[in-house]
């Protein structure tokens, strides 16, 4: 027999199969041209002096065999006997060790018999129902097809698994899904209801991400607030990266994890914008405004589990930065204008009451005036600031309001509202002897003192009801006590307390007489 | 479904050349194969040849190895198979059918194994 034909003769060796679990295995035959085919195999157990014949019966029933010596693979043309347009039957017998082993046969029409290709291009990923589901299209006139998918972890092998028969324009796998690590898919094809036939090779990797992104392990930090107004929002540490299989090192589209930084500004409830999603990679400048910040990590799958901070306002106030003036028609409050066509938004909230209680005020874009203030005025009828207790007032400005992250902190402040001269009267006025010459003057802190920066001075007045002289002496407003010497017995005085803020001049409190009594000597 | 439209047919002198062509549209990425059929009257359609469209493997009856040629072109959601022949002889005479089939079974050859067919075009050899 000629070497390229397949020989009708009887094999030169015992037609015995040993039955032994070494052997030859896994039999693939496959057109590989217009007139050529091909078969390869695998052996099981030591290879050297084994000889493999590949074996072949035709519908007819007549056998033949090719000789392939040492080689696992062997390729013959369509003129080689072996009817190619007809069912035919194959095997592979190994003679090794004065025994034959067998491989399972293969029933087969080889004409038909092409290699398919993997899945190709795009391949698409979803999550079903807790499962993954990948879809592709067919390969061009490749319908019919079983698939199978294998899988890995960073930390496992791969995994086989069964896709099942496909006889569509569009192909389908649904695939197991991991809660916390990223896996690495490869499919590969082959001819459906073709025992022998060979599977492509594996696909380009599909790199999935966990179903639950990994929770940001982050930390921040939150720089002063600048003269501009502004503080940088740092970030202390990075997230974690992913473990990626091996596959999908380096460029793993599909895997990625995206951290997202979502700002909710606290502060200014007014405002037209409260929240802004920004990059983490993004670190932005923030006003001194209190704030609420949540890293938020998606994948593929959508989001995970986000973590949230609080950034408290800053606390730092300006007490000679506002000008507050009150008329009978209402009040005004000016402040140094920070640039041309700036909105800016006005809080205020009562001294020890929750932050949920502030009230704001926004502005309409508005130019600096001569003297390069902006104002806010409000009427007595609008009821701002109108109960008599300490606000805190915080002003920010924005070219863009519409930008959660481009407002500043223009000034925060105290005020005293309502008829602060009058609420701030000093009571409980008293007069002590001190001395021959001298009295002590007590009085209880005006309700001015609860509002940080607000109280000026304590003015003292003291009137001689005989001369109609009087003086006035300031006191410290963390002073609540004076002393007044140089006064003369028997002379009937009157005293009285204001308390003064840098704007505005206090009521006196209620006349309290008093005299010095003559010492009379034994 | 899938549509076939056969074209390029004519009269030729013996020895002569032509090239059929045969467009399929609709649902040809389901095709696994294409041919060429003839048949001449009062006699049942004969083989010509086919192409395994997805590798380009072709395979012919002996009566026209080496003188036809079939190969095909891909364009989105049509295929077109050509039928180029050299040589013509007068048997060559006969209606040229299209075909497709969607199945991996059975052989080229029989007839029964094509789900799709064209209307035919005539090709006469004259002497």
């Known amino acids: 027999c000629r070497t390229s034909e397949c020989c009708f003769q009887d094999p030169p060796y015992p037609d015995a199969d040993s039955g032994s679990a070494s052997g030859p295995r896994d039999l693939r035959c496959y057109r590989i041209s217009s007139d050529r085919y091909e078969c390869s195999w695998q052996y099981e157990g030591p290879t050297a002096g084994v000889s493999h014949f590949l074996r072949c019966c035709l519908s007819s029933g007549r056998c033949c065999y090719f000789a392939a010596g040492s080689a696992t693979r062997l390729q013959f043309s369509d003129q080689a006997g072996v009817s190619v347009l007809y069912t035919v039957t194959l095997w592979v017998e190994s003679w090794a060790r004065n025994q034959t082993e067998k491989s399972p046969e293969v029933t087969l029409q080889l004409y038909n018999s092409v290699k398919y290709e993997p899945p190709l291009g795009d391949i698409k990923v979803s999550k079903l129902a807790g499962q993954l589901r990948m879809e592709w299209e067919t390969p061009d006139n490749q319908v019919g097809a079983e698939v199978q998918f294998r899988h890995r972890t960073p930390s496992s092998p791969w995994k086989l698994g069964d896709c099942g028969p496909q006889d569509d324009d569009t192909e389908s796998c649904l695939c197991p899904l991991e809660m916390n690590v990223a896996q690495e898919f490869q499919l590969r094809r082959r001819q459906l209801g073709s025992q022998g036939s060979s599977w492509s090779k594996w696909s380009s990797p599909v790199c999935v991400p966990p179903e639950n992104p990994p929770q940001p392990q982050v930390r921040f930090s939150v720089e002063q607030l600048g003269q501009d107004g502004r503080r940088r929002l740092t970030l202390k540490e990075q997230p974690t990266q992913l473990e990626l299989p091996e596959g999908c090192q380096g460029l793993a589209p599909g895997t990625e994890v995206t951290y997202r930084l979502q700002l909710h500004m606290l502060s200014c409830p007014c405002k037209a914008k409260a929240t802004r999603t920004l990059h983490l990679g993004k670190m932005p400048y923030l006003s001194g405004a209190a704030y609420n910040v949540a890293v938020i990590s998606s994948n593929q799958f959508g989001p995970g589990l986000n973590q949230t901070w609080h950034i408290p306002a800053d606390t730092h106030t300006e007490p000679v930065a506002l000008n507050i003036s009150v008329g009978t028609n209402g009040t005004t409050m000016y402040w140094p204008a920070r640039a041309q066509s700036m909105t800016y938004c006005i809080e205020w909230q009562p001294v020890g009451q929750d932050g949920g209680l502030a009230t704001c005020s926004l502005t309409a874009p508005q130019d600096p005036d001569p003297a390069g203030m902006a104002t806010y005025s409000w009427s007595r009828e609008s009821g701002a600031m109108g109960q008599e207790k300490c606000y805190y007032i915080t002003i920010f400005a924005s070219a863009h309001p519409e930008k959660l992250t481009l407002w500043s902190t223009v000034l925060s402040t105290y005020h005293f509202g309502g008829n602060a001269s009058a609420a701030g009267t000093p009571h409980h006025v008293s007069v002590k002897n001190h001395s021959l010459d001298s009295v002590s003057v007590d009085w209880a802190p005006s309700l001015l003192s609860t509002c940080p920066g607000v109280l000026k001075e304590y003015v003292v007045r003291c009137r001689d009801e005989d001369s109609k002289q009087v003086s006035e002496h300031p006191v410290q407003p963390t002073e609540t006590q004076v002393t007044l010497s140089g006064l003369r017995a028997g002379v009937a005085y009157t005293v009285q307390v204001r308390a003064d803020t840098a704007w505005l001049r206090g009521v006196w409190s209620q006349p309290q007489r008093f005299s010095i009594e003559v010492q009379v000597s034994d | 479904e899938v549509q076939l439209v056969e074209s390029g047919g004519g009269l030729v002198q013996t020895g002569g050349s032509l090239r059929l062509s045969c467009a399929a549209s609709g649902r040809t990425p389901s095709i696994v194969a294409m041919g060429w059929f003839r048949q001449t009257p009062g006699k049942e359609r004969e083989f010509v040849g086919e192409?395994?469209?997805?590798?380009?493997?072709?395979?012919?009856a002996d009566s026209v190895k080496g003188r036809f040629t079939i190969s095909r072109a891909n364009a989105k959601n049509t295929i077109t198979m050509y039928l180029q022949m050299h040589s013509l002889k007068s048997e060559d005479s006969a209606v040229y059918y299209c075909a497709a089939r969607q199945n991996w079974s059975g052989g080229p050859t029989r007839t029964n194994e094509y789900e799709y067919w064209g209307q035919g075009t005539q090709v006469t050899v004259s002497s």
């Open positions: 192409i395994i469209l997805s590798k380009g493997f072709t395979y012919y």
